[in-house]
């Protein structure tokens, strides 16, 4: 019987007696920055490599003894959930631990960069296959822990960190803050976030994806055959790596973008109970539960998107919220939510000859959140048309004039505190699809790319009575790229990406009086890539 | 006392090693930044990450580390040069009182420091 | 799926022994802590021992401490109880069971959380008479 | 060592009641409480565990409550499936002990 996390895990045509996808990851290296290990175990033993490589600090407390099975238990669980014999994720995968936490698992910032230096000169000296760097531990947000991530992972290196298990906002602790790291939280068997004593997994918009991470069995360093079952967001993070190198070792040239896009791709949508996490965190945490692709090749074709959100911006009047694409993403569109329906909208803006999305506060209002969406578009020119506010009554309107350049996404940004309160809703003229409509106090902002084989379309959902959301999807084969709401509705929170669902959220619908301001509409612009599917088809 | 007359020396010879007069101003621009643990029983005060510029030199950071030394020893305080990072990041790690902080954060080259603290097996 | 098959049972004359044993399938077993429970004619159930995956700690029901003893063999993925000085009241049927139950770490030490017993062998039947 | 008291001993009731049974430990034992039913000839089966976390494939019309010393087993709805003796069993330390059982009957 294979163990429940494993078969979690596994798409349904690898499902056998035995847990065995096709390759092991046995191309992929994977660091492990933990506990002392017992590389002898029978699980781990010819797989793990012990570096010489140790920073700890020493243990608490007079009265600690220091026990070799309880201080290597740690790390060989989790060497064990990656690559073990039989209860591993990535059974081909080789390993090397570096010893970073001390026999109660403690450790420190400064140490782990040692480790994560030790490992870039390692690399440098000498130059392998795909590397993946597991960090199952977290402290405190640290600014130089998360600059030394992200200088590994613009070196190519992948890293995967553990959330966090003090049920809390996972973008206060490091590593699991930084954006460069692929950052896991926990889930059980029935796919419920995990409790662990008061407290459990970490949440929130730092977290990429979860896994499992309660009654996970592997490597027990009690004996050399031994077995245990443990919990946390460490043994989530050890199920990612593992998938990681599996799905390196099958595409060795996939970039941390490529990467994660994927990971969110293939992973479980939806199946996670929000209710377990605060209200005002349920939107910004991704419900996705990890997995392997169905097959390690041909996901080439798809055109990846993910969504962003931004920190909070605060409540002052002039604040703002910016949300970033990695450096190998396009930000194809813009969008912005406040729980307080108090904002002044969103515009794309160049930073560092990067598009960023930048939502901005209203007068009263408690804050607004930007939502990217970033998506993988090789050999795009993407570029952003700004309409100013229009006299006319019929309101602002911009389009993607260029040859070839189609509209991603749409985004709207006004300087009045109280837009649409009193104006009738503003209709897109149909037959103008390629085209932006807003206020006409708003100034509308355009996303337009150009990219081999980019085609887009335009997808409405309206509902004429009040609703607290409204939502539009995309079909089968086309890419979620814009979300937004059509103008008009004065008690629209805002809109975001949901996989490939555009959500529209409003006010309360018992504040709201059922006029025809109660009309929501749901605007999604769905994308595919001809080019990428032709250019897979040719490499099969 | 073993270990401390190991300082002592270490001090000596940056000192030895330093011309008089050196600037204390940090270089023209923005001034470097000090950073802690918002969660106070995980910090650890007295060690600290002195972050440098991107672009710094192994070199640089060499020299920074022991014009530290050196001020810090005209002060009458003593420090230990814990490790010099390069390949990731340059800067160092100093093990020094918190009485100097100013002192570093004013040294050229320093974008910012942050104290060291604790991390957690998950 | 996890099976427990328990054999050994019979009739034994007061002041014997019996050795009860437990056939497990699948790593999951050698995993988690395993249970001895007892349930006497008519009666409920009555817990009477478990051990820890390794076999370094070991718990008894305070009637049957110094008579009965639990082990386990990990490579033959099966746990035992041998059972000595037995007497009438030890007539029972015997289930052995395991102890779903994980570890975390906080605060620098492991902590237990336990789930329950999750599954259960058919059963053997111990009769103690003269 | 500590006690568990299920009352009551023995309960009748009909298809579609809602039926609660209430288990008391002696000392407190946090939320370290499972419950199990049992039918005639068969062996127990896991339903509660850690006071009120349904065990995976247990209807949902089974629920636990309760922390310290007081618990409670609740069957929203009973169904012919449902008529068993019930166990509440407390984990303390490393060693169990069972309540005496709780027989569910028809009326």
């Known amino acids: 019987s294979i163990p429940w996390n494993l078969e979690r895990i596994t798409p349904p045509r690898y499902r056998a007696d035995e847990y065995q996808p096709p390759d092991g990851g046995s191309l992929v290296e994977v660091y492990l920055l933990d506990t002392s290990i017992q590389s002898d175990h029978r699980e781990i033993e010819g797989r793990v490599m012990v570096t010489d490589f140790e920073n700890v600090p020493e243990e608490d407390g007079t009265r600690f003894h220091r026990q070799a099975s309880k201080c290597d238990s740690h790390g060989t669980h989790l060497a064990g959930v990656v690559s073990g014999r039989d209860a591993g994720v990535a059974k081909g995968a080789s390993m090397r631990s570096l010893r970073v936490l001390n026999c109660q698992g403690k450790g420190t910032v400064s140490g782990t960069l040692i480790g994560l230096e030790f490992i870039r000169k390692s690399q440098l000296v000498q130059p392998v296959g795909p590397l993946v760097v597991l960090l199952p531990l977290a402290g405190g947000y640290s600014r130089v822990l998360n600059a030394a991530c992200q200088r590994l992972a613009r070196a190519g290196v992948v890293l995967v960190t553990a959330a966090g298990n003090f049920r809390d906002d996972a973008c206060l602790y490091s590593p699991a803050s930084a954006p460069e790291v692929i950052t896991v939280g926990a889930t059980n068997a029935q796919d419920q976030p995990v409790t662990l004593g008061t407290l459990g997994t970490n949440f929130g918009r730092c977290v990429d994806l979860f896994a499992p991470g309660e009654d996970i069995i592997g490597a027990s360093s009690d004996c050399s055959t031994c077995f245990v079952s443990q919990s946390g967001t460490s043994q989530a993070a050890a199920h990612v790596a593992g998938i990681a190198a599996m799905m390196l070792s099958a595409e060795p040239e996939l970039t941390l973008a490529e990467l994660r896009q994927r990971l969110i791709h293939f992973s479980a949508k939806d199946v996670i109970n929000e209710a377990w996490f605060p209200e005002d965190q349920r939107v910004l945490t991704p419900n996705l539960v990890a997995a392997l692709p169905p097959s390690t090749h041909g996901a080439g074709w798809q055109l990846f998107c993910r969504t962003v959100w931004s920190a909070h911006s605060g409540p002052t009047r002039m604040a703002t919220a910016v949300a970033r694409c990695a450096p190998d993403e396009e930000l194809l569109s813009c969008s912005s939510f406040s729980r307080s329906g108090k904002r002044r909208g969103e515009r794309m803006e160049a930073q560092g000859g990067k598009l960023v999305c930048r939502a901005h506060n209203a007068f009263g209002g408690e804050g607004v959140y930007a939502i990217a969406r970033c998506c993988l578009l090789p050999q795009a020119n993407c570029s952003v048309h700004t309409a100013p506010p229009a006299e006319a009554s019929m309101g602002t309107r911009v389009h993607c004039h260029q040859q070839g350049h189609v509209l991603t996404g749409c985004s709207s940004h006004w300087e009045v505190e109280d837009l649409g309160t009193h104006k009738p809703p503003v209709l897109r003229p149909r037959g103008q699809p390629n085209q932006c409509v807003g206020h006409r106090e708003a100034s509308i902002h355009a996303s337009c790319c150009h990219a081999p084989g980019l085609e887009c379309k335009v997808k409405e959902h309206g509902i004429p009575a009040p609703q607290e959301q409204v939502t539009v999807a995309c079909e089968e084969g086309w890419t979620l790229t814009g979300c937004s709401a059509l103008p008009g509705t004065s008690h629209v929170l805002g809109a975001y990406a949901v996989d490939n669902t555009c959500v529209v959220r409003s006010r309360d619908v018992s504040t709201t009086g059922s006029t025809s301001e109660g009309a929501v509409t749901a605007v999604a612009i769905c994308c595919r890539s001809r080019h990428l599917a032709q250019a897979s088809q040719e490499l099969q | 006392q073993e270990d401390e007359d190991g300082d002592y020396e270490e001090l000596v010879l940056a000192l030895r090693s330093e011309e008089d007069g050196l600037a204390e101003a940090p270089e023209h621009g923005t001034t470097a930044t000090f950073h802690r643990c918002a969660k106070d029983p995980w910090r650890l005060p007295g060690t600290y990450v002195v972050v440098l510029k991107e672009e710094t030199h192994l070199s640089q950071s060499e020299r920074t580390a022991r014009r530290l030394q050196a001020q810090a020893a005209r002060r009458g305080y003593l420090t230990k040069i814990l490790h010099v990072f390069h390949g990731l990041l340059p800067g160092f790690l100093v093990k020094m009182s918190g009485d100097l902080l100013e002192l570093a954060l004013k040294l050229p080259h320093v974008d910012y420091i942050e104290e060291d603290s604790s991390v957690f097996a998950q | 799926e996890v099976q427990l098959v328990e054999s050994g049972g019979g009739l034994v004359q007061p002041g014997g022994s019996l050795r009860l044993s437990c056939a497990a399938s699948g790593i999951t077993f050698s995993s988690y802590w395993m249970s001895w429970v007892r349930q006497a004619p008519g009666k409920g159930l009555e817990w009477v021992a478990n051990i820890k995956q390794d076999g370094s700690e070991k718990y008894y029901v305070d009637s049957v401490k110094g008579r009965f003893t639990i082990s386990r063999d990990i490579a033959k993925n099966s746990l035992y109880l041998q059972m000595n000085s037995l007497r009438a009241e030890d007539t029972a049927v015997y289930y052995c069971?395991?102890?779903?139950?994980?570890?975390?770490?906080?605060?620098?030490?492991?902590?237990?959380?336990?789930?329950?017993?999750?599954?259960w062998g058919q059963g053997t039947t111990v009769t103690v008479s003269s | 060592d500590i006690q568990m008291t299920q009352s009551p001993s023995t309960l009748s009731a009909s298809v579609g009641d809602r039926v609660t049974i209430t288990c008391r430990a002696s000392?407190?034992?946090?939320?370290?409480l499972a419950w199990y039913q049992q039918k005639p000839g068969k062996a127990p089966k896991l339903l509660i565990y850690k006071a009120s976390s349904l065990e995976s494939g247990v209807p949902s019309r089974f629920s636990g409550s309760g922390s310290g010393t007081e618990f409670t087993l609740t069957i929203s709805s009973l169904q012919p499936d449902d008529f068993a003796t019930y166990y509440c069993?407390?984990?303390?330390?490393?060693?169990?002990?069972f309540g005496q059982g709780t027989k569910l009957e028809i009326k």
């Open positions: 069971a395991r102890d779903r139950g994980t570890y975390y770490i906080a605060d620098g030490s492991y902590n237990y959380y336990y789930y329950g017993m999750d599954v």
């Open positions: 069993q407390q984990y303390n330390s490393y060693s169990y002990t």
């Open positions: 000392q407190s034992i946090s939320s370290w």
